[in-house]
């Protein structure tokens, strides 16, 4: 489980078509 103090940070993962982009790359979302 994610620690409580981490919950307001963005989490970054590799994905395709994420973060308003057409290609694959890193995407960070809260």
């Amino acid at each position: 489980r994610r620690r409580r103090r981490d919950t307001h940070f963005p989490i970054c993962i590799f994905c395709c078509g994420c973060c308003h982009r057409s290609k694959c790359g890193m995407c960070c979302k809260t």
């Epitope: 963005p10 290609k23 960070c28």
Partner: antibody, heavy 121, light 107 residues
Framework: QVQLVESGGGVVQPGRSLRLSCAAS????????MHWVRQAPGKGLEWVAV????????YYADSVKGRFTISRDNSKNTLYLQMNSLRAEDTAVYYC??????????????WGQGTMVTVSS | CYELTQPPSVSVSPGQTATITCSGD??????ASWYQQRPGQSPVLVIY???KRPSGIPERFSGSNSGNTATLTISGTQAMDEADYFC??????????FGGGTKLTVL
């Protein structure tokens, strides 16, 4: 100005441990993901590990997973790399590098000067 | 197991255009970045997201990426551009690949 300064390198015997540090200045450290990248003598670049904004959000290259641990102390503006069970093939210059700002940080936009780690008996 | 392949060396005359390629499986589906490393120095980002230039990087540096090949183009090459160049792309959250590097010689 924006700066990254690595320290902690040196000569170490196989199987031993070493901890590298990277002191950041000139930017809001906690707002950036941070990487370690290494370069063996005369060779190319090899990504080692990244830690994103949350301490729990970190990833490692297969070559170091289970042996190396990346961490950060935002209160000290410092990035760390704890290296255990060192092998001869870990010999390299170790760079810390800042991930780009924003929601799509694909590139490494600021690099430190590097610190040399030599694993030899 | 993915890998990014670059030519070991490229030579160009001053003022001419240098082209450095980086090939990898479905590379065009990922964002490519390029780094310049002068001898004895740390890498410097020159291109990101295939074709974008960071502030302070001269306009003579440009990039493209489609299919299986990303390309770094240096137009009007200068002596100061002599360096090693590395491409880079993400293939997963735990797999950031760099090309083997290309040594650019300005004759």
């Amino acid at each position: 100005q924006v700066q990254l300064v690595e320290s902690g390198g040196g000569v170490v015997q196989p199987g031993r441990s070493l901890r590298l540090s990277c002191a950041a200045s000139g930017f809001t450290f906690s707002s950036y993901g941070m990487h370690w990248v290494r370069q063996a003598p005369g060779k190319g670049l090899e990504w080692v590990a990244v830690i994103w904004y949350a301490e729990s959000n970190k990833y490692y290259a297969d070559s170091v997973k289970g042996r190396f641990t990346i961490s950060r102390d935002n209160s000290k503006n410092t990035l760390y790399l704890q290296m255990n069970s060192l092998r001869a093939e870990d010999t390299a210059v170790y760079y810390c590098a800042r991930a780009q700002e924003g929601i799509a940080p694909d590139a490494f936009d600021i690099w430190g000067q590097g610190t040399m780690v030599t694993v030899s008996s | 197991c993915y890998e990014l392949t670059q030519p070991p060396s490229v030579s160009v005359s001053p003022g001419q255009t240098a082209t450095i390629t980086c090939s990898g499986d479905k590379l065009g589906e990922r964002y490519a970045s390029w780094y310049q490393q002068r001898p004895g120095q740390s890498p410097v980002l020159v291109i990101y997201q295939d074709s974008k230039r960071p502030s302070g990087i001269p306009e003579r540096f440009s990039g493209s990426n489609s299919g299986n090949t990303a390309t770094l183009t240096i137009s009007g090459t200068q002596a100061m551009d002599e360096a090693d160049y590395f491409c880079q792309a993400w293939y997963s959250s735990t797999n950031v690949l760099f090309g083997g590097g290309t040594k650019l010689t300005v004759l």
